[in-house]
């Protein structure tokens, strides 16, 4: 850490006679440089160098030739690394009088005439005399105004807006300056600051639009940082709303976008009189072209109850916006003929959910269905298969003699989706078959006895039972089951030594 | 849909009082900047006053400063005028306004909704 | 106050006619100009925002153009509902203010 530079003459003001030369020495433990009251243009008689001394200090003097009205001020001498455009300048202070009688208050730019003030904060009116011995009284459209003042900064008060003008009498002689305007802006202890991008997803030769809005602040410095800001790629616009209320809307645009501007654009409030910061950012992505995801929530084969409602959600990522339509089995849904119905809803930016409800399902409702999204840039689709489950139900129940040789086949015909399993059960005591523990299932490898299954289609199938010869009566119950549900139907089969028995009589 | 509808106009006496009520429907009242608006029989428009979101802010006519007050009360969604110190020249049809948005919510749109507006007539 | 001057006060025009309305502002307001069109008995409904920006719903024959301190509102084809006052405002700066309005009537 270094102890701060030294100045001679050791004193912390210093009135020098006008057109007289004087010089102020600074000693440091680092390379010093010096700040002083005139600009560049305006200081050819002010004149800087390095002195050599064998301290082991480094030293820089300033030297004025004729002190003139104008060298009125404060010298700073700093060391080099620590001035930034942020800060105060931290280093040693002298403050040069140059009394002049017929220049009574040292010359400002015009710019200093403009006295911005932050709603009700005090401000200073910079009308500095070359003596620090003159008197000076600030007046206004009413009259003398009441402030303090300090011959080195001016008067310092809570203002009006309005013009103030500052008289001085040196020697009898009375001087006036031009009026300096009181202007007041508003500006908070705290930056309100909101971004909004009303697209953060573009494509390839689109232009990136981001705007920083400051609230109830007229007195901001505001800093974008974004992917082409090397390159100078962004156009920045700034636009003042004062009504509802005070806005400054800065705007950024990034016109034929690519993949590389791709990232975080930032903005960065700077309250300018206050060390009062905001930030905030959004990140933009640009695609080289149009892109489609589909993400639907269930399998490529679904079921459905006959009767039940059911929804088939498929979420979607796309831009540009996507046309979403659904199919059934290639062919284009026409909901008006159905119980089925689709919408699509934007969840986000680039996200869409697309629903198809099946309000009561019916047989027919299966089928494939499909799900296109297309942009001019992509399509995508997605195709699944929707069976509707229908419970087991017995169409038919037959019998069939083979003549004489008195074997006899039972055909049972049922229908259900997924398609039935059939069971055959028999019951030999005919008298008895009212209690369901006379009745056993037909194993397969019974003799005598063959057992069949015949699909007819999607939803039907047959089951076919042969016993190769039926010497008493017996009862025969066809079992037909899937998952929704079971049906059974029985059926008599008679001896046909019997049955001829019963014929004849 | 953005309904607003004013109540509380009536007949008052100079140097009356009176409170109108402006209630919303059909949009988020607490996002909006809301406004008053009149117009006296037979002439044209004049802005009354403009009230923030959140009531922190709220500027006036040179004409009804220190005696009207803007208000709202966003738990009901419901905006108020306070009307003190009456004068014949304030009667008028009050309508109660609101400020849209547009862009990326940057920008503004004057008055994009108006209720129906409610008499006061002032007059001894 | 910035003092917004409409004319004309009032216009006669036919169905079909091309009908134009100028608003002046006494100074600068960049384009923070609305228009209104109001029918007797009834609520002002806003026409036209930012100047030049048509509100939604508001058919397309309305168009609004200007800037600084010249605005004008143009009906490419008046239609029988279109018949009625009409108000520009500005909101570039408290308080704010409105045209006197122009009336139009059927000729």
């Known amino acids: 850490q270094l102890s701060l530079p030294s100045i001679l003459p050791n004193e912390n003001e210093k009135v020098v006679q006008l057109n007289s030369s004087f010089s102020l020495r600074c000693f440091g433990e680092s390379e010093v440089s010096w700040q002083y009251p005139m600009s560049e243009e305006e200081s050819s008689d002010v004149e800087i160098r390095n002195e050599e001394n064998n301290s082991g200090l480094f030293v820089t003097v300033l030297e004025v030739s004729s002190a003139s009205a104008a060298h009125t001020g404060l010298y700073t001498c700093y060391y080099n690394h620590t001035q930034t455009e942020e800060n105060e300048l931290e280093g040693r202070h002298i403050y040069i009088y140059v009394p002049d009688p017929d220049v009574a208050f040292v010359p400002l730019g015009m710019t200093d005439y403009l006295v911005i003030v932050e709603d009700d904060d005090s401000a200073i009116i910079p009308c500095r005399t070359t003596d620090p011995e003159t008197p000076v009284t600030l007046h206004n459209s009413e009259g003398v105004v009441p402030a303090s003042y300090d011959s080195r900064q001016g008067f310092n008060g809570t203002f009006t807006v309005g013009p103030y003008i500052c008289e001085a009498t040196v020697k009898g002689k009375k001087f006036q300056t031009i009026p300096f305007n009181v202007y007041a802006l508003k500006a908070t202890s705290e930056l309100d600051l909101e971004m909004e991008a009303l697209k953060t997803v573009y494509k390839s030769g689109e232009t990136i639009v981001v705007t920083c809005a400051v609230f109830n602040n007229e007195v901001v410095d505001l800093q974008w940082t974004y992917p082409g800001e090397v390159k100078g790629k962004g156009i920045t616009m700034l636009e003042e709303i004062k009504v509802p209320s005070i806005k400054l809307v800065y705007t950024l645009t990034v016109p034929e976008a690519t993949v590389k501007d791709s990232g975080d654009y930032e903005c960065a409030a700077r309250q300018a009189t206050r060390e009062v910061k905001e930030m905030k950012k959004v990140t933009i992505s640009v695609h080289e072209k149009g892109f489609i995801e589909i993400k639907p929530t269930f399998s490529q084969l679904e079921a459905v109850n006959l009767h039940e409602v059911k929804h088939f959600v498929v979420e979607v990522r796309a831009y540009p916006p996507p046309r979403i339509s659904w199919l059934k089995n290639n062919l284009t849904l026409i909901e008006n003929l159905t119980e089925i119905t689709t919408d699509v809803e934007k969840i986000q930016e680039i996200r869409y959910r697309s629903k198809l409800k099946l309000i009561r399902a019916k047989e027919e409702d299966s089928g494939h269905y499909t799900i296109v999204a297309q942009n001019e840039d992509a399509v995508k689709s997605y195709t699944f298969e929707l069976l509707t489950q229908v419970p087991s139900s017995i169409l038919d129940l037959v019998d069939d003699h083979h003549g004489s040789t008195g074997g006899q086949t039972v055909r049972c015909t049922a229908e259900g989706t997924p398609l039935p399993d059939i069971e055959w059960m028999i019951c030999k005591d005919i008298k008895k078959c009212n209690n369901e523990t006379s009745w056993t299932i037909l194993a397969n490898n019974v003799s005598n006895i063959i057992t069949e299954i015949h699909s007819r289609d999607r939803s039907t199938v047959e089951g076919r039972v042969t016993f190769a010869k039926v010497e008493e009566t017996i009862a025969v119950r066809c079992l037909a089951k899937n998952l929704l549900g079971a049906e059974n139907r029985e059926l008599k089969l008679v001896a046909p030594t019997l049955r001829s028995e019963l014929t004849v009589a | 849909e953005v309904q607003l509808v004013e109540s509380g106009g009536g007949l008052v006496q100079p140097g009356g009082s009176l409170r109108l009520s402006c209630a919303a429907s059909?949009?988020?009242?607490?996002?909006?900047?809301m406004s008053w608006v009149r117009q006296a029989p037979g002439k044209g428009l004049e802005w009354v006053a403009n009230i923030k979101q959140d009531g922190s802010e709220k500027y006036y006519v040179d004409s009804v400063k220190g005696r009207f007050t803007i208000s709202r009360d966003n738990a009901k969604n419901s905006l108020y005028l306070q009307m003190n110190s009456l004068r014949a020249e304030d009667t008028a049809v009050y309508y109660c306004?609101?400020?849209?948005?547009f862009g990326s919510g940057s920008y503004y749109i004057p008055f994009d909704y108006w209720g129906q507006g409610t008499l006061v007539t002032v007059s001894s | 106050d910035i003092q917004m001057t409409q004319s004309p006060s009032s216009l006669s025009a036919s169905v079909g006619d091309r009908v134009t309305i100028t608003c002046r502002a006494s100074q600068g307001i960049r384009n923070y100009l609305a228009w209104f069109q109001q029918k007797p008995g009834k609520a002002p409904k806003s026409l036209i925002y930012a100047a030049s920006s048509l509100q939604s719903g508001v058919p397309s024959t309305f168009s609004g153009s200007g800037s600084g301190t010249h605005f004008t509102l143009t009906i490419s084809s008046l239609q029988p509902e279109d018949f009625a006052s009409y108000f520009c405002?500005?909101?570039?700066?408290?308080?704010?203010?409105f045209g006197g309005g122009t009336k139009v009537e059927i000729k």
């Open positions: 059909g949009f988020t009242f607490s996002s909006y900047w």
């Open positions: 405002q500005q909101y570039e700066i408290y308080p704010l203010t």
């Open positions: 306004a609101r400020w849209g948005v």
